[in-house]
C-alpha cells in the first residue's frame, strides 16, 4: 500500500503567547504531508494547513473565536503525491493533540514599560496595554480587555545604587509608588494571572531606569 512508510505525527505541542497560537509536531516529513484539524469539545472539525510539509500550523484564527473554549487538534499524515491514500483501516493516520484552553494556558508575553513620570516623591509607572489577535466587533482587544481584573502586573523597583527589589501590584496598567527624593530608580514589570495554577507569570519587561528617555521628572 502507499502508506507503508507514512508515520503518524507525534509530540504535538501548543505554543501560544498572548493568544497567538501555533500547533507544532514531529517528525520532519519524509515522503509525506500533513493536514491539521481543530475543534472545540462540542463543535465540528475544521481543516487547516492543508497537505503541508511544515511541522507547525498557526491556529490563532480559530482559537480567538472563543478563548475560553477548550480546543482539540489532530494532525493527519498522508503519503506525498498520493493524498487520497488512506491507512490500513481505511483512514489516514492521525494523532490527537493535548486539550488546550487559551484563556487558561496561553503564555503571557513580555510586557513593556510605556512610561514613567516622577512628581516629587511619587512615580507613576505605566505598562503598555498590548494588543492581542482576539477580536470583538471588528476591533482587536488588548490583553487587559481580554483578561480584565484577572490580569495583574507586579512592578519590581529598586534604587540604582542597591540590589533589593521592592514590589508593587496593580490590576490596572498603572502604578503609583513612593520613592526617596534625589534617588534614581530602575523598574521592571511582570504580568501575572494569580487565578491560574500554571503559566502564571510572564517574563520580565526590559529594565527601565530613571534618567533615561522614557521617563519624565518634575520637581513640585
Amino acid at each position: 500500500s502507499g502508506t507503508t512508510n507514512t508515520v503518524a505525527a507525534y509530540n504535538l505541542t501548543w505554543k501560544s503567547t498572548n493568544f497567538k497560537t501555533i500547533l507544532e509536531w514531529e517528525p520532519k516529513p519524509v515522503n509525506q504531508v500533513y493536514t491539521v484539524q481543530i475543534s472545540t469539545k462540542s463543535g465540528d472539525w475544521k481543516s487547516k494547513c492543508f497537505y503541508t510539509t511544515d511541522t507547525e500550523c498557526d491556529l490563532t484564527d480559530e482559537i480567538v473565536k472563543d478563548v475560553k473554549q477548550t480546543y482539540l487538534a489532530r494532525v493527519f499524515s498522508y503519503p506525498a503525491g498520493n493524498v487520497e491514500s488512506t491507512g490500513s483501516a481505511g483512514e489516514p493516520l492521525y494523532e490527537n493533540s493535548p486539550e488546550f484552553t487559551p484563556y487558561l494556558e496561553t503564555n503571557l508575553g513580555q510586557p513593556t514599560i510605556q512610561s514613567f513620570e516622577q512628581v516629587g516623591t511619587k512615580v507613576n509607572v505605566t505598562v503598555e496595554d498590548e494588543r492581542t489577535l482576539v477580536r470583538r466587533n471588528n476591533t482587536f482587544l488588548s490583553l487587559r480587555d481580554v483578561f480584565g481584573k484577572d490580569l495583574i502586573y507586579t512592578l519590581y523597583y529598586w534604587k540604582s545604587s542597591s540590589s533589593g527589589k521592592k514590589t508593587a501590584k496593580t490590576n490596572t496598567n498603572e502604578f503609583l509608588i513612593d520613592v526617596d527624593k534625589g534617588e534614581n530608580y530602575c523598574f521592571s514589570v511582570q504580568a501575572v494571572i494569580p487565578s491560574r495554577t500554571v503559566n502564571r507569570k510572564s517574563t520580565d519587561s526590559p529594565v527601565e531606569c530613571m534618567g533615561q528617555e522614557k521617563g519624565e521628572f518634575r520637581e513640585i
Epitope: 519590581y156 527589589k165 508593587a168 511582570q190 507569570k201
Partner: antibody, heavy 120, light 107 residues
C-alpha cells in the same frame, strides 16, 4: 496538596553560618514567590525577605541585609536561606511561606518551621 | 516602613464571647491586610485576606473590616479552639510588616 517543609535548623555559635531549605510540593515555586518569616522565642512574627524564583529577584529586612541570602533551585523546587554571620538575636523559628501573588492574598501556605539557636 | 500597631496585646475571654482585635496602619495600605491565627508550636494560618474576605475553610464566626487605616478582626462567638495568638499583616508595600500580636486567653 500544597506543602512547604523547612529543614536545616540547629544550634550554631555566634559568627557561624547555617543554610535552611524550604522544599515545596503541590505547586511550582517559579510560578509564585517564597518568603521567609521568623519568630524569636515568645515574640511576634518578623518578615525576613522574599525571592521570586522565576527571576531571582530578592529583598531583605534591614535586620538581615548583607548577612542573609535567599536563593532558589527551581529544578529541585526548593528555596534556601543562607545565614552568616549569625548573631544571638537571630535565634528564632524560621518559616517559609508561599506568596500567592495577587492584590488580595499574599502568604497563603506556611511550612511547619525550623528552629535556629545561636549560642556559644 | 509601614508600622502595624495591634491592640490589645492580650485579652481574656470566655467561650461564646464576642472578641474584637484592632490594627492601625501608620499610612494608607488600601485593603492589603491579612489576619493570621497561630497556636503554640504551630505555623500561622491565614484567616482573613484583603481586610474582609474569609479564607477558604475558615469558620464564618471570623470576620474582618476596614475603616481607613484601622482594621478589625472579630470573632462573633469564641470557641475553645480559638484560643490562640492573632496577627495582622500589611502587604501593600515592601517590606510587609506584622502587628505585634494579640494573645486570646481563657478567662
Amino acid at each position: 496538596e500544597v506543602q512547604l517543609v523547612e529543614s536545616g535548623g540547629g544550634l550554631v555559635q555566634p559568627g557561624g553560618s547555617l543554610r535552611l531549605s524550604c522544599a515545596a510540593s503541590g505547586f511550582t515555586i517559579s510560578d509564585y514567590w517564597i518568603h521567609w518569616v521568623r519568630q524569636a522565642p515568645g515574640k511576634g512574627l518578623e518578615w525576613v525577605g522574599y525571592i521570586d524564583p522565576y527571576n531571582g529577584y530578592t529583598y531583605y529586612a534591614d535586620s538581615v541585609k548583607g548577612r542573609f541570602t535567599i536563593s532558589a533551585d527551581t529544578s529541585k523546587n526548593t528555596a534556601y536561606l543562607q545565614m552568616n554571620p549569625l548573631r544571638a538575636e537571630d535565634t528564632a523559628v524560621y518559616y517559609c511561606a508561599r506568596d500567592y501573588g495577587s492584590l488580595q492574598v499574599q502568604l497563603d501556605y506556611w511550612g511547619q518551621g525550623t528552629l535556629v539557636t545561636v549560642s556559644s | 516602613d509601614i508600622q502595624m500597631t495591634q491592640s490589645p496585646s492580650s485579652l481574656s475571654a470566655s467561650v461564646g464571647d464576642r472578641v474584637t482585635i484592632t490594627c492601625r496602619a501608620s499610612q494608607d495600605v488600601n485593603t492589603a491586610v491579612a489576619w493570621y491565627q497561630q497556636k503554640p508550636g504551630k505555623a500561622p494560618k491565614l484567616l482573613i485576606y484583603s481586610a474582609s474576605f474569609l479564607y477558604s475553610g475558615v469558620p464564618s464566626r471570623f470576620s474582618g473590616s476596614r475603616s481607613g487605616t484601622d482594621f478589625t478582626l472579630t470573632i462573633s462567638s469564641l470557641q475553645p479552639e480559638d484560643f490562640a495568638t492573632y496577627y495582622c499583616q500589611q502587604h501593600y508595600t515592601t517590606p510587609p510588616t506584622f502587628g505585634q500580636g494579640t494573645k486570646v486567653e481563657i478567662k
